[in-house]
């Protein structure tokens, strides 16, 4: 059997740290057997069998020029093996962050805090943190640890499915390379890391006959579980084309009527979502959708829910009193209560 312990990594490769003494081990001999060492491709002897170092080659203060392949051979010239030296650094604690797009699952991602230059893998696990009685020192088996299954294809991510929203979890991400291992522990609660995906299916439509209105509608993100006890609230932003500032509203449902749009101009609209009890943070913004308020008069047909106006909207006199708002019981969200007077913008 080989006197060389096989470090994790490809076979035939041994590892060391720059600036440190490195010992290479001849794999095909018995421990202590005297061997000769050569640099592959160079005929001069590096270390002879009379060195007193047996089957090992010692490189003092290794540097990048020492990286490469070495040949060791026995006293009678038989090949003892070839060894490739790769230099790098032991692992440092990885940087870990976790996020949840819904209240049942969360994922953690990691990256090295220092580049080791060596083959590296990550061990990922988690356990549920529980507050045990003072007399109990044992960890309940129901608390783990369990593996956190990693994404295939080497993506630096693992996913915990079926998490409990009100529980705390301890994530363990251990960076392993041939020179050692280093662990980062991260305590997470679903409540604090919850960040929904942005709402989907955002549509912006004009409201016929209302040159200052736009109706926006959207749906829950597909990743949000369809259960009634965890709702989302929304934030909507809109702005006319080429206007730098966004206006922000917080709709109560899955649609919103904007009543202060600039007539004749296309408007960008985007929405964001958050847990309705303010757990976690707001989602990123949805992709922008665009819409332009309608022009012209209200259609002659009266909608089933009642007649809003019989005349087209005109720009009121500045000093005229605001007309009363129509009563809209069947569709309370169709019109908005923020502006008492709709104004048609006159563009210079």
């Amino acid at each position: 059997s080989s006197p060389c312990p096989q470090a994790w990594g490809p076979p035939g490769v041994q590892y060391g740290q720059p600036g440190r003494s490195v010992k290479l081990c001849c794999p095909g001999v018995t421990a202590g057997d005297p061997v000769s060492w050569f640099r592959d491709g160079e005929p001069k002897l590096l270390q002879g069998p009379d060195s007193g170092l047996g089957h090992e080659l010692v490189l003092a203060q290794a540097d990048s020029t020492d990286e490469g392949t070495y040949i060791c051979q026995t006293l009678d010239g038989a090949l003892g093996g070839t060894v490739t030296l790769q230099l790098g650094y032991p692992p440092a604690r990885p940087v870990v962050s976790c996020q949840a797009a819904d209240y049942e699952n969360f994922s953690c991602t990691w990256s090295p805090s220092q580049i080791s230059g060596l083959p590296t893998r990550y061990l990922t696990s988690y356990r549920k943190k529980t507050v045990l009685g003072a007399d109990s020192q044992r960890r309940s088996p129901s608390t783990g640890p369990w593996p956190c299954p990693q994404d295939p294809l080497g993506a630096a991510r693992c996913v915990v499915h079926g998490a409990e929203f009100w529980s705390q979890y301890r994530i363990n991400v251990t960076e392993v390379n041939p020179l050692g291992a280093s662990t980062r522990l991260l305590d997470v609660s679903l409540q604090s890391i919850l960040r929904p995906d942005p709402p989907q299916g955002l549509r912006v439509e004009s409201v016929p006959g209302y040159p200052r209105r736009l109706r926006a509608s959207w749906t829950y993100p597909a990743s949000w579980p369809c259960q009634p006890h965890f709702l989302l609230k929304f934030r909507l932003q809109y702005r006319p084309a080429q206007h730098p500032a966004w206006s922000t509203v917080e709709p109560a449902g899955l649609e919103e009527v904007i009543t202060d749009a600039v007539a004749g101009l296309p408007h960008a609209v985007r929405v964001s979502a958050r847990d309705f009890l303010d757990a976690g943070t707001w989602s990123t913004w949805s992709p922008e959708a665009w819409g332009t308020p309608s022009t012209g008069t209200i259609p002659k047909e009266i909608p089933a829910w009642g007649q809003l106006h019989t005349q087209p909207e005109v720009e009121p006199q500045v000093d005229s009193p605001a007309p009363p708002r129509p009563s809209l019981q069947p569709h309370p969200r169709l019109l908005d209560h923020r502006d008492s007077v709709e104004q048609v913008a006159v563009l210079a």
């Epitope: 050569f38 001069k44 002897l45 040949i71 009678d76 010239g77 038989a78 090949l79």
Partner: antibody, heavy 117, light 107 residues
Amino acid sequence: QVQLVQSGAEVKKPGASVKVSCKASGYTFTNYWMHWLRQRPGQGLEWIGNIGPSDSKTHYNQKFKDRATLTVDKSTSTAYMELSSLRSEDTAVYYCARGDYVLFTYWGQGTLVTVSS
Amino acid sequence: DIVLTQSPATLSLSPGERATLSCRASQSISNNLHWYQQKPGQAPRLLIKYASQSISGIPARFSGSGSGTDFTLTISSLEPEDFAVYYCQQSYSWPLTFGQGTKLEIK
């Protein structure tokens, strides 16, 4: 005991090629390097190249790089040296030698290659 | 290529005498120098490796010394079978090269 038995003498015309064989016995063939050397009549020794024991990796003397090809057949524990584009100055005794990476510890009996028109 | 120069080209001595053969390298080669003996009609035989390391089966009267560029093969007391051609070989860099040989003949 270690034995290296080379193929018999050859007479070749200029421009031709010659392939000399060296059958090894008495040791594990894939554990040792095989070197090829030559000695012109009344002259010293010239190293042609060597071939690795397990991976067939070669090192050549640049002087022979374009004309010499070293190969092995592990199944028969036989090493080969082919020399192409022969000229009269290639007339020599060609040796295979088992060794370590850079030394020659056991030698074949030699193969005389005569290049003559 | 590293050039090895052997001297003398021919050395005439009698059995029982001490023989000193020299090999000089065109550049420093540390101790990467080896000695071979070749008798007429035979293949060479390794005598000394790495300047001074003895080889199993080689009589103790053969010894080597030197480092850098200057090397010596010494035969402490010549036996009749020692009369042959001696070659030095370097293994410091490719290609491996030999000296032109020293012929040790009976006086």
